[in-house]
């Protein structure tokens, strides 16, 4: 594979991680493979520091992260320890909620409005970010 | 110029196999993730495969899955498409293109097409 | 995957008309709605990208609209060289599985 010392253009980097945040929305699964064809990934916090950059550029809207439990456990995209990492969910989240009559319960994370995580309907059209790490040889994303 | 050009296309007969190359020139292919669309005589385009800028990502319509196989050499600046188990229905035109994608064009869209090369798959 | 629907599959009309062919998805795609031009032996050509934007070199005749479900390709005064097919395609799945839409073949009356 090919290093990348720089971020490509229109993406912004941070602590040797370029991050691009898209201004529309996709379902959870669609924003996972759009990272994935720029050989990137849905954003894996792994820091409070981190958080804030995100939480600074996507502003008060729904996003999604890179944190899904669609097979049970949850995991990060990247393989990232969920149980000893990072965590920012609201009071009394992850639910799991039922009550949306969508069917089935809520299996993918997403930044709020405060910028705290909730678990929400993975169809559901939010922004999201994609995040590459510099210095680091291009390679097949782990799968889900 | 921006240009993409397809060959590799030929009559092959049902189960048999095919690679067909899509040639870059003018832009940074390495940058850029690339598609594979056909086109049946008198039907719509039909998206086929899509690989990643570097080739570690790749996705592949239902119908093909399993039996065509999307690379590229970045080096060579060009794309591959790796067709086996071939049936009568993947008869058509294929097209490469261009994946442009809002991290670094105003769209989602394939901007860029090769001219196209035939596959007939007959006995 | 979200199903893309054209209308009409064909249309006849004469130089200087105006024209609309209409496309329709099965979910809301937001905005990622992107419009082609075919003619026979050619490969498509970008015209519209999402949804309303035209692609540099495209003349202004063409226009497109719509967002969620319901979208139009516009072509304001018909010139000889617009008859052929135009396709839409949706994005808003990644990948674009069944993202182009039937087709509508413009023709001469």
């Known amino acids: 594979g090919s290093e990348r010392t720089c971020c490509p253009v229109n993406w912004v980097e941070h602590e040797r991680s370029c991050y691009w945040f898209s201004r529309s929305g996709k379902a959870w699964a669609d924003a996972d493979n759009y990272c994935r064809l720029e050989d990137a990934h849905l954003v894996v916090v792994t820091s409070w520091e981190e958080q804030k950059f995100v939480q600074h550029h996507i502003g008060p809207v729904n996003t999604w992260m890179g944190l899904h439990d669609q097979n049970g456990p949850w995991k990060w995209v990247d393989g990232t320890d969920y149980e000893t990492g990072f965590k920012n969910w609201r009071p009394e989240q992850p639910d799991d909620w039922y009550g949306h009559g969508l069917g089935g319960g809520e299996d993918c994370a997403h930044f709020t409005d405060d910028g705290r995580w909730n678990d929400d309907v993975c169809q559901r059209p939010y922004r999201w970010v994609c995040e590459t790490e510099l210095d680091k040889a291009s390679q097949e994303p782990p799968l889900l | 110029e921006v240009q993409l050009l397809e060959s590799g296309g030929g009559l092959v007969q049902p189960g048999g196999s095919l690679r067909l190359s899509c040639a870059a020139s003018?832009?940074?292919?390495?940058?850029?993730?690339m598609t594979w669309v056909r086109q049946a005589p008198g039907k719509g385009p039909e998206w086929v495969s899509v690989i990643s800028g570097s080739g570690g990502s790749t996705f592949y319509a239902d119908s093909v899955k399993g039996r065509f196989t999307i690379s590229r050499d970045n080096s060579k600046n060009t794309l591959y498409l790796q067709m086996s188990s071939l049936r009568a229905e993947d008869t058509a035109v294929y097209f490469c293109a261009r994946y442009c994608s809002s991290t670094r064009c105003p769209y989602d869209a394939f901007d860029i097409w090769g001219q196209g090369t035939m596959v007939t798959v007959s006995s | 995957g979200v199903q893309m629907t054209q209308s009409p599959s064909s249309l006849s009309a004469s130089v200087g008309d105006r024209v609309t062919i209409t496309c329709r998805a099965s979910q809301s795609i937001s905005g990622y709605l992107n419009w082609y031009q075919q003619k026979p032996g050619k490969a498509p050509k970008l015209l519209i990208y999402a949804a309303s934007s035209l692609q540099s070199g495209v003349p202004s005749r063409f226009s497109g609209g719509g967002s969620g479900t319901d979208f139009t390709l516009t072509i304001s005064s018909l010139q000889p060289e617009d008859f052929a097919t135009y396709y839409c395609?949706?994005?808003?799945?990644?990948?674009?599985?069944?993202?182009f839409g039937q087709g509508t073949k413009l023709e001469i009356k």
């Open positions: 395609q949706q994005t808003y799945n990644t990948p674009p599985e069944r993202s």
């Open positions: 003018g832009f940074t292919f390495s940058s850029y993730a």
